[in-house]
């Protein structure tokens, strides 16, 4: 009889452990759902203004294929230009092809004329290699013409239809780039 009671007690305890596990799993699942929900709400909030005018790019940004570009109206040094772009969820322009270079230079001609615009290109102080900010090297046709004899850090900029180099601490306009929102149509 005592053995029977002991067995029942053990079974009840096992059941209790299983229920505690299930509750723990449920709590974890609920927490995960809450986090996902928070992300959805954040995403919705971010997307609503864009969806309202159904534009792939924000106001005052120019679209070309999958990218949006912003041509600054202020001057800054290269590092500050980079931070200004990051503030809008973008980076300094990375030119991937001659087609993109042509689009940029064509747009600049229409907007502002022949000024200097920082892009996301800088020269490694040790190796002298040119690098885009994501770590990739520019294609051979998109290497800056050697113009800077600076002992300081050297960065790339666009002027007219050329890619040139200059001391990163000089003041120039800048161009930011980010992905265009995909249309759901």
């Amino acid at each position: 009889k005592l053995l029977q009671v002991s067995t029942i007690a053990m079974q009840q305890q096992e059941k209790l452990i299983q229920q505690e596990r299930a509750l723990l799993n449920f709590t974890e699942w609920k927490r995960s759902c809450a986090l996902q929900m928070k992300y959805c709400q954040a995403f919705m909030q971010n997307s609503l203004s864009s969806a309202h005018n159904s534009s792939p790019c924000p106001n005052n940004w120019i679209q070309n294929r999958e990218s949006c570009y912003y041509v600054s109206e202020i001057w800054s040094i290269w590092h500050t230009s980079q931070e200004n772009c990051l503030k809008e969820g973008s980076t300094l322009l990375q030119i991937e092809s001659k087609e993109e270079m042509d689009f940029i230079t064509g747009s600049l001609r229409k907007i502002k004329g022949s000024y200097d615009y920082w892009v996301g290109l800088s020269q490694d102080g040790h190796s002298g290699r040119w690098l885009w900010q994501d770590g990739s090297s520019p294609s051979p046709g998109l290497l800056p013409a050697e113009r800077s004899q600076s002992a300081n850090q050297v960065c790339g900029y666009v002027k007219s239809n050329s890619l040139l180099s200059s001391n990163c601490s000089t003041w120039k306009y800048f161009i930011c780039e980010k992905y265009a929102l995909r249309s759901s149509v």
Epitope: K38, Q45, N46, L86, K87, S90, T91
Partner: nanobody, 117 residues
């Protein structure tokens, strides 16, 4: 309001690795990009790596090829994986949340990284 909390710093030997974490708490949808900065004694704070809300990554030349920035959207955390560490990587590492133009950005308190044998 957003709070940023760094962790993962410490002492490591040259050639070693560290993974720094930056956890964001609060109105995270305000943040458009997150950047990792570092400041060594007597030097200016410099941007080491950044990641935008669209997932575009940026690296300073000094860490390119040795560091990787990534994010975990579920846990609202951005990581900086640093490999092949050198003594000159020793600094206090801060994360920064970039908000839109004309808005104030958010900074964490910093985590110390020391590379020495």
């Amino acid at each position: 309001q957003v709070q940023l909390q760094e962790s993962g710093g410490g002492r490591v030997q040259p050639g070693g690795s560290l993974r720094l974490s930056c956890a964001a708490i609060g109105s995270i949808f305000e943040i458009n990009s997150i950047g990792w900065y570092r400041q060594a004694p007597g030097k200016q704070r410099e941007l080491v790596a950044a990641i935008t809300s669209g997932g575009i990554t940026n690296y300073a030349n000094s860490v390119q090829g040795r560091s990787t920035i990534s994010r975990d959207n579920v846990n609202n955390t951005v990581y900086l994986q640093m490999n092949s560490l050198k003594p000159e990587d020793s600094a206090v590492y801060y994360c920064k949340g970039f908000t839109g133009w004309g808005k104030e950005d958010y900074w964490g308190q910093g985590t110390q990284v020391t590379v020495s044998s």
